[in-house]
């Protein structure tokens, strides 16, 4: 594949990255589908400025993002890793809270009306971001 | 009601140490990250340093990097500031304070005068 | 690292009128622009946060506006309490910054 110079028509780009930002809602393993269909990923926060990009884009809206821990460690859908990584929950959370009545804890994270993180049930349609990295190389074949 | 109180100012010799503290109450001081800001005295404010709630992210300034640490012990409530190096520059007063969603400071401790001369 | 300039330095105002502070970011910064009061002797209080909400507990003769690189905080009514010094600071991206201070004081 060729290596993307520029990113996709609707997608913004910010410091070698390209985001997408849907408007309507799906459950994290389809929003988390979704983006690997369009060889990108749920977007994955490694600092306080991609925090604030993408906070000032989604709004004050609940919107998933590819951090999740249904096998057990929250883990980043890239491989970032967590322990050392970019944190920014909410205040107590994450809580894997099971009072929702849903079945099951919470297990999907993302980002709330004030930009900080939570944990929710990974069925319920949110919005989403999907992220691809510039530099790496597209599953497109290259023009001739 | 939420407080931060600061202790460990003084006078210090220029290149020498001090630690200073920030004692926290009436909030869950577990998951906030903290700040330390600085204010020359007659001039503006500066920040520090920031720590994660869990100690995991720190940033510093440019002018503190390398001299200062930032490091908390939550199981004492309490947010620390390790200055190295100190310099005549350094002499100021020492705010703590709490941080509100990413890089806003809701609650200010009192000061603690930090004065660097020989 | 982002530089934040405020304007004027210093003013003098009456019981009553209206003061505009600005605050110019060197880069965008969104809407992550935070005022501050400050007391001699005391502790900077957030006043706004993200460019126009008013922190819990401030009159609402407080008000801000902008976005990108300019903003403004607005005094309606200035009340005796108002006087002292106000600054902003961008939280878009460490190291945060905060400009230089405007002091406002009784004509």
């Known amino acids: 594949g060729s290596e993307r110079t520029c990113c996709p028509v609707n997608w913004v780009e910010h410091e070698r990255s390209c985001y997408w930002f849907s408007r309507s809602g799906k459950a994290w393993a389809d929003a988390d589908n979704y983006c690997r269909l369009e060889d990108a990923h749920l977007v994955v926060v490694t600092s306080w400025e991609e925090q604030k990009f993408v906070q000032h884009h989604i709004g004050p809206v609940n919107t998933w993002m590819g951090l999740h821990d249904q096998n057990g460690p929250w883990k980043w859908v890239d491989g970032t890793d967590y322990e050392t990584g970019f944190k920014n929950w909410r205040p107590e959370q994450p809580d894997d809270w099971y009072g929702h009545g849903l079945g099951g804890g919470e297990d999907c994270a993302h980002f709330t009306d004030d930009g900080r993180w939570n944990d929710d049930v990974c069925q319920r349609p949110y919005r989403w971001v999907c992220e691809t990295e510039l530099d790496k190389a597209s599953q497109e074949p290259p023009l001739l | 009601q939420v407080q931060l109180v600061e202790s460990g100012g003084g006078v210090v010799q220029p290149g020498r140490s001090l630690r200073l503290s920030c004692a926290a109450s009436?909030?869950?001081?577990?998951?906030?990250?903290m700040h330390w800001v600085r204010q020359a005295p007659g001039k503006g404010l500066e920040w520090m340093a920031v720590?994660?709630?869990?100690?995991?992210?720190?940033y510093y300034a440019d002018s503190v990097k390398g001299r200062f640490t930032i490091s908390r012990d939550n199981s004492k409530n309490t947010l620390y500031l390790q200055m190295h190096s100190l310099r005549a520059e350094d002499t100021a007063v020492y705010y703590c304070?709490?941080?509100?969603?990413?890089?806003?400071?809701?609650?200010w401790g009192q000061g603690t005068l930090v004065t660097v001369s020989s | 690292d982002i530089q934040m300039t405020q304007s004027p330095s210093s003013l003098s105002a009456s019981v009553g009128d209206r003061v505009t502070i600005t605050c110019r970011a060197s880069?965008?910064?969104?809407?992550?622009l935070n005022w501050y009061q400050q007391k001699p002797g005391r502790a900077p209080k957030l006043v706004i946060y993200?460019?126009?909400s008013l922190q819990s507990g401030v009159p609402s003769r407080f008000s801000g506006s902008g976005s990108g690189t300019d903003f403004s905080l607005t005094i309606s009514n200035l009340q005796p309490e108002d006087f002292s010094t106000y600054y902003c600071?961008?939280?878009?991206?460490?190291?945060?910054?905060f400009g230089g201070g405007t002091k406002v004081e009784i004509r």
């Open positions: 304070a709490r941080d509100e969603r990413l890089g806003i400071f809701d609650y």
């Open positions: 009436g909030f869950n001081f577990s998951s906030y990250g």
């Open positions: 720590i994660w709630y869990d100690g995991s992210n720190k």
């Open positions: 880069q965008n910064i969104y809407s992550y």
């Open positions: 993200s460019t126009s």
């Open positions: 600071q961008q939280s878009y991206s460490p190291p945060l910054t």
